[in-house]
């Protein structure tokens, strides 16, 4: 399977919400011995590799951040610590995962990474990630709404492993 | 070990335009962090002018924005101030310097020397 | 914007001494838990350097006779004993908001 992140850019500005999202794509093993792995974190672009850092995203771990579940099943962090930090990570039935970020801030702007991990029998398979920045402006030159620019099709398909 | 050296001008005349590069030694302006310009009024304390990000977007202090560019230039890994319609009030040292972007910390951890910018017909 | 006052202006200190500086914010500068506020020494004609970062966080290479406390607005960088070479002016600095602002700097001699 493979990651592809729809959007490689989100221009937006203070106190708005966004959604950042990433697409599970290809054959996805639905056996009850397979279950997906699925995070986000901070990262840079690196000078080595982009994503091999991990951050955390308004003090919380991708431990704090993660969803796991069975292939195509839906899900979401319902759990009070993330959303007090405003934030939500959830998971549909098409493999879209994305993580909602309320109230935006200059210090929220930077490189969001997605990981997704493939465990079978309680071991990790394969993982992939792919990778967009996300850039809140301040002051009055900033945009009202959300700007979100397409990444290339090269980009799209982020099949790095991590 | 990351090394940052401002250069430029020592005197620019009032009305004209302030321009200072900062070449930065040791580390890719591209991977990652913020790249800021900082002053000093001789005498006074900082003030923060602005930053670039390693993905270029900028940020610039509101008092100033109206003057001030921020640019980078990648093939000699270095970034640049434009400030212009420049007054007596400019004249500083001024300072560049790299803040950590894209993390719970943002602050200032390598600074330049330094470059004395006089504003004088 | 967020305005840093920082008390005293000036300090004399005897050489082993402890010595405090205070920083007010005009807000808080609270970020999901972490305090940004950091603390710069700038010696007799150099650059200013890092000492303390989010608050209480001891820069790599800073002796460990420095140390920051506080959160919300207010805030205390601490030096245990105070050495000659720990002259030059102290700025506290919040980076929650934009624009960055600084204190106006407290300035250390030794008595």
């Known amino acids: 399977f493979k990651v592809a992140t729809p959007y490689s850019l989100y221009v937006c500005p203070e106190g708005q919400n966004v959604t950042l999202t990433c697409r599970l794509l290809g054959p996805v093993d639905k056996g009850h011995d397979v279950t997906f792995y699925k995070t986000w974190y901070r990262s840079s672009r690196g000078e080595v590799q982009t994503c091999s850092e991990r951050r955390p995203i308004r003090n919380l771990t991708f431990q704090d951040l993660h969803l796991h579940h069975g292939g195509h099943q839906a899900a979401n962090t319902s759990h009070d610590l993330a959303q007090r930090h405003g934030l939500e990570s959830a998971s549909d039935h098409h493999g879209n995962f994305s993580i909602t970020m309320r109230n935006l801030t200059l210090l929220d702007s930077g490189l969001y990474c997605c990981l997704v991990v493939e465990i079978r029998h309680h071991h990790s398979e394969h993982r992939v990630h792919g990778a967009m920045e996300l850039q809140v402006q301040t002051g009055k030159d900033a945009p009202s709404n959300c700007v979100v620019y397409p990444s290339s099709s090269q980009d799209s398909e982020n099949i790095t492993a991590a | 070990q990351v090394q940052l050296q401002e250069s430029g001008p020592g005197l620019v005349k009032p009305s004209e335009t302030l321009s200072l590069t900062c070449a930065v030694s040791?580390?890719?302006?591209?991977?990652?962090?913020?790249w800021n310009w900082i002053r000093q009024p001789p005498g006074k304390g900082l003030e923060w002018i602005g930053f670039i990000t390693y993905s270029g977007s900028t940020n610039y202090n509101p008092s100033l924005k109206s003057r001030v560019t921020i640019s980078v230039d990648t093939s000699k890994n270095q970034f640049s101030l434009k400030l212009s319609s420049v007054t007596a009030a400019d004249t500083a040292v001024y300072y560049c310097a790299r803040s950590h972007y894209g993390s719970t910390y943002w602050y200032f951890d390598v600074w330049g020397q330094g470059t004395t910018v006089t504003v004088s017909s | 914007d967020i305005v840093m006052t920082q008390t005293p202006l000036s300090l004399s200190v005897t050489p082993g001494q402890p010595a405090s500086i205070s920083c007010r914010a005009s807000e808080s500068v609270e970020y999901y838990g972490t305090s940004l506020m950091q603390w710069y020494l700038q010696k007799p004609g150099q650059s200013p350097q890092l000492l303390i970062y989010?608050?209480?966080n001891v820069e790599s290479g800073v002796p460990d006779r420095f140390s920051g406390s506080g959160s919300g607005t207010d805030f205390t960088l601490k030096i245990s004993r105070v050495e000659a070479e720990d002259v030059g002016v102290y700025y506290c600095?919040?980076?929650?908001?934009?624009?960055?602002?600084f204190g106006q700097g407290t300035r250390l001699e030794i008595k």
């Open positions: 040791g580390y890719s302006i591209t991977s990652d962090y913020a």
């Open positions: 600095q919040q980076t929650r908001k934009v624009p960055w602002t």
């Open positions: 989010a608050a209480s």
